[in-house]
Interface confidence: low
């Protein structure tokens, strides 16, 4: 393995070996080795042992290697909304008089117009709009399932608000279900959460588009506010390229530090797409803070400086106890833009573009 | 700003302006700029603004600078674990035949024991063991709040099992509460959650250590599986060196390669405490993978190199179009171990320690 | 139990002031403490509090960056630093200990209070 | 601004029964936080007089009682005495801001 120069692996063990020498004694705060002498000799308490079993369990649990994200998460997305079902559509007839929830429907065949292959879809959300509303409430959604079953999704516990709000819920695994399966109608259940003694379960929370007093308002202003799905996708001919093979790749962490420090921190960079790229084809935004990484990282030698001061520096400069610590971004977020190809414009979203933070690892 | 050679700002701009150039084209999957000629004058369709607001207030609301984490976080966590109340006690009285529901009371003195100060909390879940089950039940946890009252905390959905297991929930927030109010009984309700229109809503799991059966059986054995708190904690002596000022730290992501991959990827390194740093101290375990990252990233010319085949490298080796990418630590998982201090054995978990996949950044 | 602030008196904006709060008849270095203002004719304004190894210290939004509360635990004192003092910052200010180790939920003894004035 | 909501002003007759309210939100009072009372007689310090939303402090006579629901927190006096006139306020930790905040305060005037 080379970079630019040779790589002597050994090392680069032995740096990262006693990094780790520092890093361990650094987050315990010892100075050096705690003394041996006054150690019971046997094996350890049972008491012990359980307590550092639960712990090892939880880390095992909680860690257990995430899915990895496929190749295709690095490119752009394209955005649609679909609207639900009309509320003058018979299909709601039944669902009138249910005092403890509101019904939403959807056609399929409008989903699959927008993604036409399940795998395309990389995130689906539900947004209702709710009026304002003076009332706390905890609200549960659920998905159709079969004929006369529904399918817990999610809650919310929604305090009283004095303007609209709009309410977001993660549904990418039902609509990709949605998708495999053949077209129809599916739908959302948004409930009252009922308790198991209380005898008022009703539905306090009104959402645009739904609720009974509002039902006749269905003009475009209406429209925009009703119930939607907002979906991201890639499309179909950019799909092509994509490989099965999944591969892994970054997404989001924690971060950085004032913009008077030498060492590694964020720095401002604002890209303007015309004079920076001379691009006159992004119509929205016109620009946007990229940002980038700089500063130096030193790598610390704890060999011979097992003390206080240096092993306090660990946590600021090499906190994952690198071999060679290096400034990078540490948490991105992604740009929205709106383009055209030929005349129909396209709002796709770039992952990954701004550089909120940066971090020595 | 310097590292080890003068860095010329202008050209790091100007190498992060045309990565970005790159990024953007690589994730349209475009080989130039689309041609602007046949674009309709005028502004944008109201839809079209319409998706390209929904799209952004969804960045914006996903986004929002996340709680920067204290930098208590670097340092190792005491891990503790405190026991529900035991059910002979008058307290479980009045809650005996209630069908929906079970109750686990904690004595807040106890907790206040392990983790004398709230800000010294890091994570506390509440660990409680299920014992095998054929039915599946859709469950809810709820915290005591006031006389009559209780606060949602958050459901699962348990699926028949075979074997006893472990259901954990993270309860940080409400042993802070704990820990900021007066010392007394607090408790928890572990309910079947009740259906809007079942009228069966009877608790079907059983817990260990509470279901009614097992009640005579409190030995040893069994207090190792009752319910209890998993408490993780800055110890107050380690916590005095600790500046109240925050800065934030990395966490998690996602990832790797092959091991054959010649660029940046995980490189396996086992460290064994004994052998490699020279400590009998540390009791438990023996020792880890560490492993650490290693391999080129090259930076990628896009300004006159715009065609697929290099587009097509930034995914790998640039993601995040940066002006000199580097191999550094993508996920990271801690790291429990055992010592002792005199007499006393302390199990403490190491955050960030164990390095699970590299990324160019 | 008593609680007795010293350090008021009259300073110039942009000045700095540090208020002293000599504690006794409990176990200060197990308690949460706090310090809480009112300007005259003024409702009362919490302004900070500190756990009781000053491990912690939480500050109102209006003071933040200009008060250091700090302990010293074997001279049973708590202490307001107060720097770039405004006109706005006059007020009776009380020490008070803490109905908890945090010093957030509320407190149950209050000092006398002393009054800082700032005027040019 | 006050982040709890007070009445400015009550009054009431030796004997009656007066209610102070103050008003919240889901980060103060509604997010189970426990509130306190205070009483500060004209001139003097503050004294605490409930804590724990509804524990009354030492020495406090059972006339004052508190009480909660929701958001919205009540002290409660009863046989009101001339000796209750004096200015109340509510405090509650808030998890929003991270620190303590005080109603604005209810001047009872005892007529």
């Known amino acids: 393995l080379s970079t630019c120069k040779t790589i002597d692996m050994e090392l680069v063990k032995r740096k990262r070996i006693e990094a780790i020498r520092g890093q361990i004694l650094s987050k315990l705060r010892l100075a050096s080795p705690p003394s041996q002498g006054e150690v019971p000799p046997g094996p350890l308490p049972e008491a012990v042992l359980a307590l550092y079993n639960s712990t090892r369990d939880r880390v095992a649990g909680e860690s257990a290697d995430p899915e990895p994200e496929p190749e295709a998460d690095y490119y752009a997305k394209e955005v649609t909304r679909v609207l639900m079902v009309d509320r003058n559509n018979a299909i709601y007839e039944k669902t009138k008089d249910i005092s403890h929830s509101i019904y939403m429907f959807f056609n399929t065949s409008d989903i699959r117009e927008a993604v036409p292959e399940p795998p395309l879809l990389s995130r689906a959300e539900l947004r209702l709009q709710r009026l304002k509303s003076s009332v706390e409430q905890h609200v549960e959604l659920y998905q159709k399932y079969s004929n006369n079953s529904w399918r817990y999704l999610g809650n919310r516990l929604l305090t009283p608000t004095d303007t609209p709000e709009w309410l977001s819920f993660d549904v990418t695994g039902v609509v990709r279900q949605w998708l495999n399966a053949g077209d129809g109608i599916q739908g959302f259940r948004f409930s009252a959460h009922c308790s198991c003694d209380s005898k008022d379960n009703k539905l306090h929370v009104e959402i645009n588009g739904i609720s009974p007093k509002r039902r006749g308002d269905l003009g475009t202003i209406h429209d925009m506010n009703r119930p939607f799905l907002l979906l991201m996708a890639t499309p179909l001919e950019r799909a092509q390229h994509l490989h099965s093979s999944r591969h892994r790749r970054a997404l989001d962490t924690n971060y950085c530090f004032s913009s008077t420090e030498k060492n590694c921190c964020v720095r401002q960079l604002y890209i303007d797409f015309r004079k920076d790229l001379g691009w006159k084809w992004i119509h929205e935004p016109k620009g946007y803070h990229a940002n980038f990484c700089l500063g130096p990282c030193p790598y610390i030698w704890s060999l011979d400086t097992q003390y206080s001061k240096v092993l306090a520096l660990y946590n600021q400069h090499n906190p994952g106890a690198s071999a060679s610590p290096c400034c990078v971004p540490q948490a991105l977020e992604p740009l929205p833009i709106v383009y055209y190809v030929g005349r129909k414009p396209k709002v796709e979203q770039l992952s990954n573009m701004i550089v909120r933070s940066c971090k020595c690892s | 700003l310097s590292t080890c050679k003068t860095i010329d700002m202008e050209l790091v701009k100007r190498k992060r302006i045309e990565a970005i150039r790159g990024q953007i084209l690589s994730k349209l999957r475009l080989a130039s700029p689309p041609s602007q000629g046949e674009v309709p004058p005028g502004p944008l369709p109201e839809a079209v603004l319409a998706l390209y607001n929904s799209t952004r207030d969804r960045v914006a609301g996903e986004s929002a600078d996340p709680e920067p984490e204290p930098e208590a976080d670097y340092y190792a966590k005491e891990v503790t674990r405190v026991l529900m109340v035991d059910r002979n006690n008058a307290i479980y009285e009045k809650t005996k035949d209630i069908s929906h529901s079970i109750y686990m009371f904690f004595n807040t003195s106890d907790i206040r024991e392990a983790v004398p100060e709230p800000p010294l909390l890091s994570r506390a879940e509440l660990r409680l063991q299920r014992l095998k089950s054929s039915v599946e039940q859709h469950v809810e946890l709820y915290q005591k709040y006031s006389n009559n009252s209780w606060r949602y905390l958050g459901n699962r959905l348990l699926t028949p099992t075979d074997t006893p297991e472990w259901l954990s929930f993270d309860v940080t927030g409400v042993v802070r509460q704990w820990l900021n109010a007066g010392d007394g009984i607090q408790g928890f309700r572990f309910s079947a959650h009740c259906s809007c229109d079942s009228k069966d809503n009877k608790l079907h799991v059983e817990i260990n250590g509470i279901s009614p059966k097992r009640r005579g059986d409190l030995g040893t054995i069994h207090d190792m599986n009752r319910p209890f708190l998993l408490l993780m904690a800055t110890p107050l002596e380690r916590a005095q060196h600790l500046h109240s000022s925050r800065h934030r730290r990395a966490l998690d992501t996602n990832y790797c390669f092959s091991s054959t991959e010649k660029n940046c990827c995980v490189r396996q390194l086992y460290i064994d405490f004994r052998k490699d740093l020279g400590w009998k101290w540390i009791h438990e375990p023996k020792g880890y993978h560490a492993n650490f990252c290693l391999g080129p990233c090259p930076y990628i010319w896009s300004l006159d190199t715009q065609y697929s085949k290099v587009l097509a490298l930034y995914n790998q080796h640039n993601p995040g179009a940066s002006a000199s990418p580097c191999c550094v630590p993508q996920a990271l998982e801690p790291l429990p171990i055992v010592y002792y201090v005199g007499r006393k054995p302390k199990v403490e978990q190491l955050s960030n320690m164990i390095v699970r996949s590299c990324k160019c950044s | 139990l008593q609680l007795v602030e010293s350090g008021g008196g009259l300073v110039q904006p942009g000045g700095s002031l540090r208020l002293s709060c000599a504690a006794s008849?409990?176990?200060?270095?197990?308690?949460?403490m706090a310090w809480v203002r009112q300007a005259p004719g003024k409702g009362l304004e919490w302004v900070s509090a500190?756990?009781?190894?000053?491990?912690?210290?939480y500050y109102a939004n209006s003071v933040k960056g200009r008060v250091t509360m700090s302990r010293d635990n074997a001279k049973n004192t708590l202490y307001l630093q107060m720097n770039s003092l405004k006109s706005e910052d006059t007020a009776v200010y009380y020490c008070?200990?803490?109905?908890?180790?945090?010093?957030?939920?509320?407190?149950?003894?209050w000092g006398k209070g002393t009054l800082v004035t700032v005027s040019s | 601004q006050s982040v709890l909501t007070q009445l400015s002003s009550m009054s009431g007759s030796p004997g009656q029964t007066v209610t102070i309210t103050c008003t919240g939100s889901?980060?103060?009072?509604?997010?189970?936080?426990?509130l306190s009372w205070y009483q500060q007689l004209p001139g003097t310090a503050p004294k605490l007089l409930i804590y724990?939303?509804?524990n009354r402090a030492s020495g406090v006579p059972n006339r004052f009682s508190g009480s909660k629901t929701g958001s919205l927190a009540s002290l409660t006096i009863t046989g009101l005495q001339a000796e209750d006139e004096a200015d109340y306020y509510c405090?509650?930790?808030?998890?929003?801001?991270?620190?303590?905040?005080f109603g604005g305060g209810t001047k009872l005037t005892v007529l």
């Open positions: 405090g509650c930790y808030d998890d929003s801001l991270n620190t303590y905040v």
């Open positions: 008070a200990k803490g109905l908890v180790s945090s010093g957030l939920n509320g407190m149950d003894y």
């Open positions: 889901s980060s103060n009072i509604g997010g189970g936080y426990y």
């Open positions: 008849g409990f176990t200060f270095s197990r308690s949460g």
């Open positions: 500190i756990t009781p190894g000053g491990t912690a210290t």
């Open positions: 724990n939303t509804n």
